[in-house]
Interface confidence: medium
Amino acid sequence: RTVPPMVNVTCSEVSEGNITVTCRASSFYPRNITLTWRQDGVSLSHNTQQWGDVLPDGNGTYQTWVATRIRQGEEQRFTCYMEHSGNHGTHPVSGKVLVLQSHW
């Protein structure tokens, strides 16, 4: 069976004009998934991103996340790329800043 992920992008305020953008994928199966941030269509280097592991969400499906830190005002240049079971999509940063606990 294949259950496509639900993808959600959020922003959190951090200091000095930077924000942390987090892309969360949830409720997907099977477990193998691509999730990465892209700037102007190009994947960011590995060491500028932080990933959570792919973990069960309690419903027989899985969840994970990827986060990166960007300059506030440049949100429109960044997209979260998702690939799962042959399907793929890009998800933009909304620009709406939420006050969330950072992963960093």
């Epitope: 193998n32 691509t34 999730l35 994947s43 590995h46 592991d53 990827v66 690939e83």
Partner: antibody, heavy 119, light 108 residues
Framework: QVQLKQSGPGLVQPSQSLSITCIVS????????VHWVRQSPGKGLEWLGM???????DYNAAFISRLSINKDNSKSQVFLKMNSLQADDTGIYYC?????????????WGQGTSVTVSS | QILLTQSPAILSASLGERVTMTCTAS???????LHWYQQKPGSSPKLWIY???NLASGVPARFSGGGSGTSYSLTVSNMEAEDAATYYC?????????FGSGTKLEIK
């Protein structure tokens, strides 16, 4: 720095079981999964299975009936046990860290445990 | 399972030469999940190129990778002595995850 150090027997009798311990340092088993891969002259590199951070396991169907992978997060140890070994199980067994990120490549390898199945 | 066929099995090259080895998959593999490893005799494999074209840390820029679908390649633009090794392609696209049989790159 990231290290995976393996210990285990070099010689196993046919039909007996193999146990290898992989002790990791420089990272936590609560944040990285670990694969087991073996290498033999006849079959090359073969993926055996892996254990995720939450302790769940994925196995190569060819080995699922005689392979188990476990871990002890507090001791930073991962364990491989394979039953009913035969001569064609001879090879080098590696524990390997599952890289994070969009590629999930095997980014750090242990030094390998050379296993000979022979009477 | 996905079979990865590497060719040639042995590749002899002169120092300074440009060389390319290929990896052909029996069914389509996402470029995100196609990786290359380098192994020298007596040592463990090392991650060399990940996701088709990204060089792992410390890998010289003379290495490059490319491809999509069922056809992938690794190229050395300017062969050096330290590049002599066996290179394996690997797919993490579908379980069981598989490796190619390797291309041994040697100095002519």
């Amino acid at each position: 720095q990231v290290q995976l150090k393996q210990s285990g027997p070099g010689l196993v009798q046919p039909s007996q079981s193999l146990s290898i311990t992989c002790i990791v340092s420089g990272f936590s088993l609560t944040t990285y999964g670990v694969h087991w891969v073996r290498q033999s002259p006849g079959k090359g590199l073969e993926w055996l299975g892996m254990i995720w951070t939450d302790g769940t396991t994925d196995y190569n169907a060819a080995f699922i009936s005689r392979l188990s992978i476990n871990k002890d997060n507090s001791k930073s140890q991962v364990f491989l046990k394979m039953n009913s070994l035969q001569a064609d199980d001879t090879g080098i067994y590696y524990c390997v860290r599952k890289g994070h990120g969009y590629y999930y490549a095997m980014d750090y390898w242990g030094q390998g445990t050379s296993v000979t199945v022979s009477s | 399972q996905i079979l990865l066929t590497q060719s040639p099995a042995i590749l002899s090259a002169s120092l300074g030469e440009r060389v390319t080895m290929t990896c052909t998959a029996s069914s389509s593999v996402s470029s995100s999940y196609l990786h290359w490893y380098q192994q020298k005799p007596g040592s463990s494999p090392k991650l060399w190129i990940y996701s088709t074209s990204n060089l792992a840390s410390g890998v010289p820029a003379r290495f490059s990778g490319g491809g999509s679908g069922t056809s992938y390649s690794l190229t050395v633009s300017n062969m050096e002595a330290e590049d002599a090794a066996t290179y394996y392609c690997h797919q993490y696209h579908r379980s069981p995850f598989t490796f190619g049989s390797g291309t041994k790159l040697e100095i002519k």
